[in-house]
Interface confidence: low
């Protein structure tokens, strides 16, 4: 059985191969059971988490996890060295950065010690599945009077990175987005110096060197203007 | 082992030019993203340009049209090209392989650069 496993995590093209022995018809064993799924998420490319719901098993059964890189150099097959556990029950597999190759096809291999032929393989592109961390250092200085210019950080060489800048004021009721490029900064023309304005920031590994569907969290907010007005009927309404 | 060894900079006047070199080895080039980054005094890093495997090119807004990146994958070697050199070009140029070419406080897959100052 060949299957392509379609996920929402930029790896459409991920094929999974599950190795299943072949049954009498009148009978299941355990290793017909399909594997769960393996999630992997590269966190600012500092370590990988590759993790899989291990409550789908029938019974608490200490999968293990194998990986390799397919067609490079960094092709042996390497054990899991360092296990996460939900409630002493494997769950997945942390990398450290050392053995971290973007740019190269990552392999992962599940399996249950119990029934080897039980087994999963996937293989993911890593630089679909970076989440750097959130945007620090927001800093806030006025170009002019009525333009504000918003600066932040990340902890990457920053043309790896998009990023989505959200502003309101203490009267909006939403968020305004704009989207902004490697360049990390973000021009408001127009601010009315009797409103007070929030802005945070989030980014995502993408277009330049990946092509990561997920954002990194939200930065902490950042606030410029005069303190909230008593006359904001936006307040009113949620006080009422 | 990752080396990665530049070369090519010095010293030369404004609206010059300049083909600095990253010679590699240790890895296989050819399939490896390559970028130059560069470093004035008491500044950080700065990205400049990007060559991934496939060819493409990706240029910082500060040097495009003006430097030009490639590689020969033959001679395990990457190259850039500085034309039009200002005084703020001024710094220390490194290259850097694929694996964390991005990621800002690792040190372990760039090289030991080669400087590049732009004076009259």
């Known amino acids: 059985l060949n299957t392509t496993i379609l996920t929402p995590n930029g790896n459409e093209d991920t094929t999974a191969d599950f190795f299943l022995t072949t049954m009498p018809t009148d009978s299941l064993s355990v290793s017909t059971l399909p594997l769960p799924e393996v999630q992997c998420f590269v966190f600012n490319v500092e370590y990988m988490n590759c993790t899989w719901n291990s409550s789908s098993e029938p019974q608490p059964t200490n999968l293990t996890l194998h990986y390799w890189y397919k067609n490079s150099d960094n092709d042996k097959v390497q054990k899991c060295s360092h296990y996460l556990f939900s409630e002493e029950i494997t769950s997945g597999c942390q990398l450290q950065k050392k053995e971290i190759h973007l740019y190269q096809t990552f392999v992962v291999q599940l399996q249950d010690p119990r029934e080897p032929r039980r087994q999963a393989t996937q293989m993911l592109k890593l630089q679909n599945l970076v989440i750097p961390w959130a945007p620090e250092n927001l800093t806030l200085h006025k170009l002019s009077e009525s333009q504000l210019e918003l600066n932040w950080n990340n902890r990457f060489l920053n043309h790896c990175l998009e990023h989505l800048v959200q502003y309101r004021t203490d009267w909006d009721h939403s968020w305004t987005e704009q989207s902004v490029d490697y360049r990390h900064k973000f021009s408001l023309p127009s601010v009315d110096g009797q409103k007070r304005y929030t802005f945070r920031v989030r980014s995502r590994f993408n277009p330049l060197c990946g092509s990561a569907q997920h954002w990194s969290e939200w930065s902490h907010p950042i606030h410029w203007g005069s303190n909230t007005s008593k006359e904001n009927p936006f307040l009113f309404a949620l006080e009422a | 082992q990752v080396q990665l060894q530049e070369s090519g900079g010095g010293l030369v006047q404004p609206g010059g030019s300049l083909r600095l070199s990253c010679a590699a080895s240790g890895f296989t080039f050819s399939s490896a993203h390559m970028s130059w980054v560069r470093q004035a005094p008491g500044k950080g890093r700065e990205w400049i340009a990007s060559?991934?495997?496939?060819?493409?090119?990706f240029y910082a807004d500060s040097v495009k049209g003006r430097f030009t990146i490639s590689r020969d994958n033959a001679k395990n070697t990457l190259y850039l090209q500085l034309n039009s050199l200002k005084a703020e070009d001024t710094a220390m140029y490194y290259c850097?392989?694929?694996?964390?070419?991005?990621?800002?406080?690792?040190?372990?897959?760039r090289g030991q650069g080669t400087q590049v100052t732009v004076s009259s």
């Open positions: 850097a392989t694929n694996r964390l070419h991005y990621y800002s406080d690792d040190d372990s897959l």
């Open positions: 060559i991934y495997s496939g060819g493409g090119t």
